[in-house]
Amino acid sequence: TPLGPKWPEPVFGRLASPGFPGEYANDQERRWTLTAPPGYRLRLYFTHFDLELSHLCEYDFVKLSSGAKVLATLCGQESTDTERAPGKDTFYSLGSSLDITFRSDYSNEKPFTGFEAFYAAEDIDECQVAPGEAPTCDHHCHNHLGGFYCSCRAGYVLHRNKRTCSALCSGQVFTQRSGELSSPEYPRPYPKLSSCTYSISLEEGFSVILDFVESFDVETHPETLCPYDFLKIQTDREEHGPFCGKTLPHRIETKSNTVTITFVTDESGDHTGWKIHYTSTAQPCPYPMAPPNGHVSPVQAKYILKDSFSIFCETGYELLQGHLPLKSFTAVCQKDGSWDRPMPACSIVDCGPPDDLPSGRVEYITGPGVTTYKAVIQYSCEETFYTMKVNDGKYVCEADGFWTSSKGEKSLPVCEPVCGLSARTTGGQIYGGQKAKPGDFPWQVLILGGTTAAGALLYDNWVLTAAHAVYEQKHDASALDIRMGTLKRLSPHYTQAWSEAVFIHEGYTHDAGFDNDIALIKLNNKVVINSNITPICLPRKEAESFMRTDDIGTASGWGLTQRGFLARNLMYVDIPIVDHQKCTAAYEKPPYPRGSVTANMLCAGLESGGKDSCRGDSGGALVFLDSETERWFVGGIVSWGSMNCGEAGQYGVYTKVINYIPWIENIISDF
């Protein structure tokens, strides 16, 4: 059998006066009791109605009643001021039963045909209530055949009486330092049969203050204290209330950080409730006085628990706790009314004594030893032998505590050695090898390490030499014994330098010609520049104009002399540059392989011979005077030549340095 509701048997039918449609007799009394199933009512209407009309229907009438209530007393054919005929009206029972009584008196002045009526049971819509009557349900009413049910809005639950909606108003916890809470639906009437609990729970150290605001309306009683609805306030110290009636309760200073508010309502009444605005206070901390040259933010009238302030220093002043710097400072007020950190100082920024400048000096401009904010210092390089690299040397103590140049640089200026200074101011005539005098070739470097070789000082920590001269030591740089500042090869008086690394041109192939015969040695320490130790300049772009054929260059070294021994004293020779084609042709004949002279080489010497560099001079510089700058520069590096030095028709071959400027600059900048 299919499941589902069991519908009641249908209730419907017809009623009529005795003898209908004929006239009814006198002295008739007839009663019908109609009953519908629970949850249903009866509907009745007349299709015919013709009864004797009398004042207030005293003689003949049809009376409709439901329970104890008379719904209508009907007579006549049409309604008058004092009598009612049914006309087209429909009549409804109040519950599930309807009584119909027909009565005729002892006489009729004329014949009356009585009535005919039809009835039927129909569902009662319990959700429809007459104006002024209490609604069936608190919130939502749902009608169905034979009955109804109630439901509630979100935040409410249906009471066990199945009609009232009780508010779900417990368990709310307020943790902010201030806020508002109110009875449910405020300012509309609060719900019935509800028990609400609100908690204010602040951090220890705070004290809650309650203010009742706007209006207060809670059901009361003239004699008994709040017997129906009431509001109570509980703290860990005491209970306040109960409160009811229409008077706003006074402010409550709870002196507690936790408060429980209870609101209980009964099943009746129509009252708007209450609203509380709560705030909190705490023991204030001492008012923060800003240190000199500082200010407090934010500025408040008072600072209580969890309030904080920060200190900001004026430009040029910094936060210090004693000697220790702080980037920022924020103090927080604690529950005992003390700050969690002591006040720092705003001290004038002190950049401290400026760093020493290698090969230079510093001068205090603002005042002797003044190193505070906006103080000015002036760096300068040791005159004659050093010059300052792209910097005017003026530094200011800035607010960040660093000495800063006019270009915003915080690093020290660089004192670069002046290059190409020599006691010789011009190239000499072509004459035999000469002994060098002090300061003639201050760039000259003596390299010992297996063999004797030479090099030229670049800057104050690099040596330019020939690749073949240091090839054997490329993996053991520390084996190189580097000497400078002396004329005598065997003198004990010299400046010692040691190699940190050897860089051989990647295009150089040992024992396969001398192309790319160039190397750089990085010294492990800077050397002090003076009149006997000065770097050689690298050629400018325009340098080739001083290195044309027949222009005079100067080679220097301790290499083999005409006697066949290494020179004891530094020697030099002035030699002209030889036409490149002429030099190439000179080395095309055996025993020299074709292509010995490349575009990376330049040749110098006399066709007649006798003036040349020789073994032991390898790696030394062939230098030229730049007449525009009046500085000497390296044009060539002693590389190779004929088996017999100074041989007629043969020339000394030198690495052409101008071809290697990018390589030299890259190595020096990278390392």
């Epitope: 706790q321 004693g322 702080l326 660093f402």
Partner: antibody
Framework: QVQLQESGPGLVKPSETLSLTCTVS?????????WNWIRQPPGKKLEWMGY???????SYNPSLKSRITISRDTSKNQFSLKLSSVTAADTAVYYC???????WGQGTLVTVSS | EIVMTQSPATLSVSPGERATLSCKAS??????VAWYQQKPGQSPRALIY???YRYSGIPARFSGSGSGTEFTLTISSLQSEDFAVYFC?????????FGGGTKVEIK
């Protein structure tokens, strides 16, 4: 959780340079504070060597000024100590710490000996 | 430099008793003083900064006081874990300096 950890060789030869690094986790060394190097020779009291601040400024103990360098590598959140020309008197447990000592490394013993 | 002198060098106290440690600065250091506890083989542990401010996590039995040149660290009721060496430290001026330490031992 702020943590500091010293690292570096435990043995250094006389006249060489002592190098130590302090790696900081849980806090950026550029955010705030001074970052110190402090040492404690065996059986002796603590000695402050110097600091590098959040901004990169340094302050050194005058007794060490000619030999000490404190630097930092912000990309690695590290600061370093270099002490040149060491002698046996530089043998100590070396600590790095923050500001006025709220956080310390566990310390590393450096012995100066040939 | 500012010299920090601690006294006594050794303090013998029974557990549960009060210990008072003194530190004197050779010059005015304001309240720029910190106190540390150090146990053998361990790095120092910060207790107090700015003379009287206790670091979070440090038990309330430790308290600091003083300003100018005289400072005190008080341990109200010594626990077994409190037996250690205690250092004071001034950070008022360069060079920052430490006291020689007070060893608190069990009586």
């Amino acid at each position: 959780q702020v943590q500091l950890q010293e690292s570096g060789p435990g043995l250094v030869k006389p006249s060489e340079t002592l190098s130590l690094t302090c790696t900081v986790s849980g806090y950026s060394i550029t955010s705030d504070y001074a970052w110190n190097w402090i040492r404690q020779p065996p059986g002796k009291k603590l000695e402050w060597m110097g600091y590098i601040s959040y901004s990169g400024r340094t302050s050194y103990n005058p007794s060490l000024k000619s030999r000490i360098t404190i630097s930092r590598d912000t990309s690695k959140n590290q600061f370093s100590l270099k002490l040149s020309s060491v002698t046996a008197a530089d043998t100590a447990v070396y600590y790095c710490s923050r500001h006025y000592g709220d956080y310390w490394g566990q310390g590393t013993l450096v012995t100066v000996s040939s | 430099e500012i010299v920090m002198t601690q006294s006594p060098a050794t303090l013998s106290v029974s557990p549960g008793e009060r210990a008072t440690l003194s530190c004197k600065a050779s010059q005015n250091v304001g309240t720029n003083v910190a106190w540390y506890q150090q146990k053998p083989g361990q790095s120092p542990r910060a207790l107090i900064y700015s003379a009287s401010y206790r670091y979070s996590g440090i038990p309330a039995r430790f308290s600091g006081s003083g300003s100018g040149t005289e400072f005190t660290l008080t341990i109200s009721s010594l626990q077994s874990e409190d037996f250690a060496v205690y250092f004071c430290h001034q950070y008022q001026s360069n060079p920052l300096t430490f006291g020689g330490g007070t060893k608190v031992e069990i009586k």
